[in-house]
């Protein structure tokens, strides 16, 4: 049975040309994780494996940096940026759990005026 | 230039090790993971693991684990893939090959170990 | 683990040719797939990887694409020294797998 559940960093915001940091957590299970893989909609960013180290995508390697821990930072942000980003966290026993995290990019303005979402 | 020397051809019977080696060059050893492949006779190719030296983390094929070895020498930059209680479909080229920078596919390859089992 | 079959097995073709493998992944692997050549008795040499993106000093006449499960690797024009074994290999989870490669012959 899958007992784990994924915190995440919920809804975020970031100003456009600044940086982010993806995190999330993955709790209440004795599951070993194998690999984490950060995703977002149908393109691999990263795969964090427990063993082997990271791995970048190469569309992504002069804009993402690993960590820290299983995370992963988003840098040089644009507006094309904003959407849905997923952490795949992959176990033994259990399976796979997955989070999800909101991002939106604002242009440095609107940003400045405390545009935030809140995190539920 | 970067380069992956393997060790030369062995015969082993069956139940016996053998112990490859891979000593590499042109590059810092500690910063790529090495992967080994296994072929065998007009067959493809087949993962059987791979090591980070840094860490030393180490990642197997289920299908391997318990009979194939993976470790490195820091010091000589060399990657080892020993393989006991050998049998008859043991009988490969094995191949050590270096994980590309931060990437999991290979950008170099060892020239290849032939292991012969037989009786 | 992810199985990855590659069509056809074997293939005929002349000089000058435009060939296409095709790869098929068992589940999504995004874009975590990479091209090999293997010539008779030589280690295989690293052409495409992360699906499309060519190999330091691979001929632009190699290309591949797709994403998810499905994915294209060709050769624009058939060159005499491109006869060889063509192996995809997936790098989304371990154990990483190969499919069983596709042997282009001279016709």
């Known amino acids: 049975m899958m007992t784990g559940t994924i915190e995440t960093t919920g809804n975020i915001s970031a100003e456009k040309g600044g940086s982010i940091i993806l995190q999330c957590h993955l709790s209440s299970t004795t599951a070993q994780v194998t690999q984490v893989n950060w995703e977002q909609q149908d393109q691999l960013l990263a795969i964090c494996n427990a063993d082997l180290g990271w791995h970048i995508s190469p569309s992504f390697k002069d804009r993402v940096a690993p960590g820290p821990g299983l995370g992963l930072t988003l840098q040089s942000l644009t507006v094309n940026d904003t959407g849905e980003y997923f952490c795949i966290y992959h176990t033994y026993p259990d399976g796979t759990y997955t989070g999800r995290i909101f991002l939106e990019v604002l242009e440095s303005s609107v940003a400045e005026h405390g545009a935030r979402f809140q995190i539920p | 230039e970067v380069q992956l020397v393997q060790s030369g051809a062995e015969v082993k019977k069956p139940g016996a090790s053998v112990k490859i080696s891979c000593k590499t060059s042109?590059?810092?050893?500690?910063?790529?993971?090495m992967h080994w492949v296994k072929q065998a006779p007009g067959k493809g190719l087949e993962w059987i693991g791979g090591?980070?030296?840094?860490?030393?983390?180490?990642s197997y094929n289920q299908k391997f684990k318990g009979r194939a070895t993976l470790t490195v020498d820091k010091s000589t930059n060399t990657a080892y893939m020993e393989l006991s209680s050998l049998r008859s479909e043991d009988t490969a080229v094995y191949y050590c090959?270096?994980?590309?920078?931060?990437?999991?596919?290979?950008?170099?390859w060892g020239q290849g170990t032939l292991v012969t089992v037989s009786s | 683990d992810i199985q990855l079959t590659q069509s056809p097995s074997s293939l005929s073709a002349s000089v000058g040719d435009r060939v296409t493998i095709t790869c098929k992944a068992s589940?999504?692997?995004?874009?975590?797939v990479a091209w090999y050549q293997q010539k008779p008795g030589k280690a295989p040499k690293l052409l495409i990887y992360?699906?499309?993106y060519r190999n330091t000093g691979v001929p632009d006449r190699f290309s591949g694409s797709g994403s998810g499960t499905d994915f294209t690797f060709t050769i624009s024009s058939l060159q005499p020294e491109d006869f060889a074994t063509y192996y995809c290999?997936?790098?989304?989870?371990?154990?990483?797998?190969f499919g069983q490669g596709t042997k282009l012959e001279i016709k």
């Open positions: 992360s699906a499309s």
């Open positions: 090591l980070k030296p840094d860490n030393g983390g180490i």
């Open positions: 290999q997936q790098h989304y989870s371990t154990p990483f797998t």
């Open positions: 042109g590059y810092t050893f500690t910063e790529f993971t």
């Open positions: 090959a270096r994980g590309a920078y931060y990437r999991y596919d290979a950008d170099y």
């Open positions: 589940q999504d692997v995004k874009t975590a």
